[in-house]
């Protein structure tokens, strides 16, 4: 969490951002909130990116002002116009690219004063893993698949019954480049599993951590998946 203040004490407002991550090819949100003003026409929002000459986005007098917008963000940005009046300056970024990663500044001007805060934005790819029984294998085998990851993640298997066990000798993980030549499909196979035990396939890179669980019993297969973004620090 980054909280920024204006330069002069009497004319400063608090601006708060949250470090976040974008999934390439999908839409992302750069979060920023500020002390709201009564009049929308008195609020100016500027989003800037370190190393980029033009603006990422500008909103003033109740509407977008994109004449100074940098080419790399053309047609890809929007604020939540109806929420600006309540202090939401968050930016929606369409079709996130790897190159969108970096340090952003959310700069706010209102009738109360000015304020800004920086935001670290990471980009990569992350997806939910699905763990299934592999029926093509000769022994009791599980197969964990996740369609899109970048950078290359680590894959670790764990089990509820054998807590702390190292499954690296009885598992095999492969990474297959997807058609756009950036993200990769993750496939990990775990051999010699037993019933009535919950197995977890944990995939992690510096952006996200995802877990797929499976438990096979005589009467059913229970599955659960979970994905968590890392380093979502507020400032």
């Amino acid at each position: 969490l980054i909280i920024g203040f204006g330069i002069s004490g009497r004319h400063s407002i608090t601006v708060t951002t949250v470090a976040s991550a974008g999934n390439i090819g999908e839409d992302g949100i750069l979060s920023c909130t500020f002390e709201p003003d009564i009049k929308l026409s008195d609020i100016v929002i500027q989003w800037l990116k370190e190393g980029v000459i033009g603006l990422v986005h500008e909103f003033k007098e109740g509407k977008d002002e994109l004449s100074e917008q940098d080419e790399m963000f053309r047609g890809r940005t929007a604020v939540f116009a109806d929420q600006v009046i309540v202090g939401n300056a968050s930016l929606r970024l369409k079709n996130v690219q790897l190159t969108d990663a970096g340090t952003y500044k959310c700069y706010i001007i209102t009738s109360k004063g000015k304020g800004n805060a920086n935001l670290e934005y990471k980009t990569g790819a992350f997806s939910m893993p699905e763990v299934n029984v592999d029926y093509n294998a000769s022994s009791e085998t599980l197969r964990c698949e996740a369609p899109r990851w970048f950078p290359q993640p680590t894959v670790v298997w764990a089990s509820q019954v054998d807590q702390g066990a190292n499954f690296s000798e009885v598992s095999n993980t492969s990474f297959e480049l997807n058609s756009e030549n950036v993200t990769m499909k993750v496939v990990s196979v775990l051999y010699n599993v037993t019933i009535n035990n919950t197995y977890s396939c944990m995939i992690e890179n510096d952006i996200a951590k995802a877990t797929g669980d499976i438990k096979v019993t005589e009467s059913e297969i229970k599955r659960r998946s979970h994905l968590q973004l890392l380093n979502s620090k507020a400032s």
């Epitope: 029984v133 029926y135 019933i195 096979v216 005589e218």
Partner: nanobody
């Protein structure tokens, strides 16, 4: 209550054929893989064949491949084992059983019927 009732066994000459049936009740048949297991009198049980819930995937123990065919009729909650080219070593009590997956370790199976005896002899 899970019930599995096997039928269709009998005495057959070597090279002959039989069709075993297993009528299932007490559970949602289409949620389960169905398996055939056999037991030679005085010996342990041996897995024979399996079929997926929708019938699209089947597999067999090596010694019966090409001779036995597993099938199922989900409308009738019944699984079948068609046996051709029977040999003396196929003599056994045949059981059907269910499991949530295609895994087929004998110790995983919990529900058994009374079995049906197949005797191959001249």
């Amino acid at each position: 209550e899970v019930q599995l009732v096997e039928s269709g066994g009998g005495l057959v000459q070597p090279g002959g054929s039989l069709r075993l049936s297993c009528a299932a009740s007490g559970f949602t048949f289409t949620d389960f893989w169905m398996h055939w297991v056999r037991q030679v009198p005085g010996k342990g049980r041996e897995w024979v064949s399996r079929i997926s819930p929708d019938g699209s995937s089947t597999s067999y123990e090596d010694s019966v491949k090409g001779r036995f065919t597993i099938s199922r009729d989900n409308a009738k909650n019944t699984v079948y084992l068609q046996m051709h080219g029977l040999r003396a070593e196929d003599t056994a009590v045949y059981y059907c059983t269910r499991f949530s997956t295609g895994w087929h370790r004998i110790e995983y199976f919990q529900h058994w019927g009374q079995g049906t005896l197949v005797t191959v002899s001249s």
